[in-house]
Interface confidence: medium
């Protein structure tokens, strides 16, 4: 049987080497000489020769300093043989435990740790965690029992102890109130990790804490009073630029300004934010009227895109806006004037007076009137009074110039301001009808076939309006009824059917047709009739000598 006491060896021993560890014995040595040997890691396998055994005495020795952090336990096998080389014992496992010395200081996992905390954070708020490791034995010793401390804080403002560290976990927390990004945007802490629960070997690292922004600063107008001027009637004109400063982080919602006009009920102004420099650009939202109001005093408030995190006073500014008078065009009242007038209105007589008003009540101005568009040249205007009269006969049935019984003329009024301004008015003459047009046939040229002629429809047209139109009366005159007949085609008597009474020779005929409207205005029209060498419905055929209808037998 083997006699092997427990074996442990401290690391980093000084020597001298080899140094005795334990004496191994086999109780078979009573029966004869026993020779000892060892095999395994540290003996005959790498690292070879760290451990040796005296062949005859069984003293196990270490030949060099050990390093627990490299190999913490060696597993060897002891062998015992007699002088003839025969084994007297089965091999026995030997465990050599390397005991720890505090030969490793803690190492931080990073040289620089980065963390962030909101400004104004309350004490107790966790910021970040630093971590260190120690290669020594943390099971059986305190050689790797790390305690964390903060060695320094830069800046030491507003308090030298703004942060604290959990000595056991390395969690850094806020401990003092007063974190203010605008005053101290970053803190640099030197943190220490020391083993032996803070009493042993130590190392340091840096923790950089960024104080992040909250909206704890309002935008402030500087200056708080502004003046600007703008011409009347012009929208989207820049009046002035408002300047603000905001101590919060630039180009963040806590910095970006939002402007509000407190006393612009009419929505006549607008302030937009210049995204580059946060300026407020005051513009007109619509045209202003100098004659209505010459000056505006605006109160403008400024806030941020996001709400204030704290109770802050909203900065306000006063903007005085002077409206500049601009020469405005005279305004016709109404802008479109309708006048009813009979088409037989007397030439040279005044139809109406059409005048414009001068908006520039603060200017003494004279208005001059002219006719700008009068396509039929029917009108003239008094340049001083705006009285409009006829210079020629009106004609409702002049369909080139009159649409739907309405004649449209444009009148302009020009003031004598600087520069000159011109306004336009529209005059609509609603022409009432006079029975000045007799009915006429359509078509006036008609073709018949010599054989089996087809009757032809003739429409009766009157340019006038009812009641000066249908029902019409038609009558063949100058003996035309001898060879021709007519009859009404419809109850309104707006068309007739013409046909020959007998077979006619090929040739051209003239037929006198008297047409009369409902008001007995009549007119005799000569129809041109051609009889063609054909049968049924006639197309256009060759001309023959005219034959007087009245003379035709």
């Amino acid at each position: 049987d083997w006699v092997i006491p427990p074996i442990s060896c401290p690391e980093n021993e000084k020597g001298p080497f080899p140094k005795n560890l334990v004496q191994i014995k086999s109780n078979k040595d009573k029966e004869g000489k026993v020779f000892y040997s060892i095999t395994g890691q540290g003996a005959d396998t790498p690292p070879v020769g760290v451990f040796i055994i005296e062949r005859e005495t069984g003293w196990l020795k270490v030949t060099e300093p050990l390093d627990r952090e490299r190999i913490a336990t060696y597993t060897l096998f002891s062998h015992a043989v007699s002088s003839n080389g025969n084994a007297v014992e089965d091999p026995m496992e030997i465990l050599i435990t390397v005991t720890d010395q505090n030969d490793n200081k803690p190492e931080f996992t990073q040289e620089v740790f980065k963390g962030s905390v909101m400004e104004g954070a309350l004490p107790g708020t966790s910021v970040m965690e630093v971590t260190a490791t120690d290669a020594d034995d943390d099971v059986n010793t305190y050689n790797a029992a790390i305690a964390y401390t903060i060695l320094s804080q830069d800046p030491e403002l507003p308090d030298k102890n703004m942060f604290t560290i959990n000595r056991n976990t390395g969690v850094i927390s806020v401990v003092t109130t007063g974190l203010d990004r605008e005053s101290f945007p970053t803190y640099t802490l030197v943190v220490q990790a020391a083993d032996l629960q803070g009493e042993g070997l130590s190392t340091t690292a840096t923790a950089v804490i960024t104080v992040t922004d909250t909206n704890d600063n309002p935008p402030i107008f500087n200056p708080t009073t502004y003046k600007g001027q703008v011409p009347e009637n012009e929208a989207n004109v820049v009046i002035t630029t408002l300047k603000v400063t905001d101590a919060d982080a630039p180009n963040t919602p806590a910095w970006e300004a939002v402007y509000t006009i407190l006393n612009d009920d009419g929505g006549q102004f607008v302030v937009t934010t210049n995204p580059v420099n946060n300026d407020g650009i005051l513009k007109t939202a619509k045209g202003l009227d100098f004659e209505a109001k010459q000056q505006y005093i605006l109160h403008v408030a400024v806030t941020n895109v996001v709400p204030f995190e704290v109770s802050l006073t909203t900065s306000t500014a006063t903007v005085t806006v002077d409206v500049l008078d601009v020469n405005e065009a005279p305004i016709f009242v109404p802008p479109e004037k309708r006048v009813e007038v009979s088409e037989d209105f007397g030439v040279g007589q005044e139809i109406t007076s059409y005048t414009a008003q001068e908006p520039d009540t603060f200017m003494e101005q004279k208005i001059t009137y002219r006719i700008w568009r009068d396509t039929a040249n029917w009108l003239e205007i008094n340049p001083d009074t705006g009285a409009i009269s006829t210079r020629a006969e009106l004609d409702r049935e002049d369909f080139e110039h009159v649409k739907n019984s309405t004649y449209t003329a444009l009148i302009i009024a020009t003031d004598n301001g600087s520069p000159v301004a011109t306004g336009t008015g529209t005059l609509l003459l609603i022409l009432s009808d006079v029975n000045d047009n007799a009915p006429i046939p359509e078509p006036r040229t008609i073709f018949f076939c010599e054989r089996n002629p087809k009757p032809q429809v003739i429409n009766i047209i009157d340019a006038d309006l009812p009641p000066n139109t249908s029902p019409f009366t038609a009558e063949l005159t100058h003996g035309a009824s001898a060879n021709w007949t007519i009859q009404y085609n419809d109850p309104t008597q707006e068309s007739i059917i013409l046909k020959p009474k007998m077979a006619l020779e090929v040739g051209d005929y003239k037929i006198n047709l008297k047409l009369m409207d409902n008001q007995n205005k009549d007119q005799v029209t000569t129809l041109e009739v051609s009889v063609c060498d054909c049968e049924g419905a006639a197309g256009v055929c060759r001309k023959a000598q005219p034959v007087e209808a009245g003379l035709q037998i």
Partner: antibody, heavy 117, light 111 residues
């Protein structure tokens, strides 16, 4: 002299509301986080709520969360505690206190709040 | 988080010394040096007598001293006087809510 003076306590029925005020003087009020601590009759101290110096951050004990609101007006050097939906177990002396360097100091004189029908 | 543990009462005769313990955990007392002690006389507000384990505010008698070992802090009062009879509360900073933990209080009786 640094001083904190509470006001606004009294008797209120369960479910009712009350607002405590704490007027500060003798120190830069806006630079300090402030806290409310209460003490039920014959009992120990219990932290209730806290607010950062700027007023941007507020914290509450679980027992009062959703019912109490802490606020401050730095222009008036005054701390407030709005207490709604009061319960019998909210009966206590309420103290305001300033927080600095891991310590509550100074403390107000305290104000009794009694919740009873 | 539970309160810090203090003895309910201690007593001593005038001129004697007494010690009041305050036991927490490795996340509060054991983790930080921000342990404070408050004295409260009946019907009065708490008064700070020690901060950061052993720092006395001006005006506080040097008979009051503090110490800390591991997760336990201690308040010692030497040369007991009648006016020392009061309730004593310890508190510790803790990361997270609530950021101040109180002990249950210790009643000191001067015999």
């Amino acid at each position: 002299e640094v001083q904190l003076l509470e006001s606004g306590g009294g008797l209120v029925q369960p479910g009712g509301s009350l607002r405590l005020s704490c007027a500060a003087s003798g120190f830069t009020f806006s630079s300090y986080a402030m806290s409310w601590v209460r003490q039920a009759p014959g009992k120990g101290l219990e932290w209730v709520s806290a607010i950062s110096g700027s007023g941007g951050s507020t914290y509450y004990a679980d027992s009062v969360k959703g019912r109490f609101t802490i606020s401050r007006d730095n222009s008036k050097n005054t701390l407030y505690l709005q207490m709604n939906s009061l319960r019998a177990e909210d009966t206590a002396v309420y103290y305001c206190a300033s927080w600095g360097d891991g310590t509550l100091n100074p403390w107000g004189q305290g104000k009794m709040v009694t919740v009873s029908s | 988080q539970s309160a810090l543990t203090q003895p309910a009462s201690v007593s001593g005769s005038p001129g004697q010394s007494i010690t009041i313990s305050c036991t927490g955990t490795s996340n509060d007392v054991g983790a930080y040096n921000y342990v404070s002690w408050y004295q409260q006389h009946p019907g009065k507000a708490p008064k700070l007598i020690l901060s950061e384990v052993n720092k006395r505010p001006s005006g506080v008698s040097n008979r009051f001293s503090g110490s800390k070992s591991g997760n336990t802090a201690s308040l010692s009062i030497s040369g007991l006087q009648a006016e020392d009879e009061a309730d004593y509360y310890c508190s510790s900073f803790t990361s997270g809510l609530p950021w101040v933990l109180f002990g249950g209080g210790t009643k000191l009786t001067v015999l």
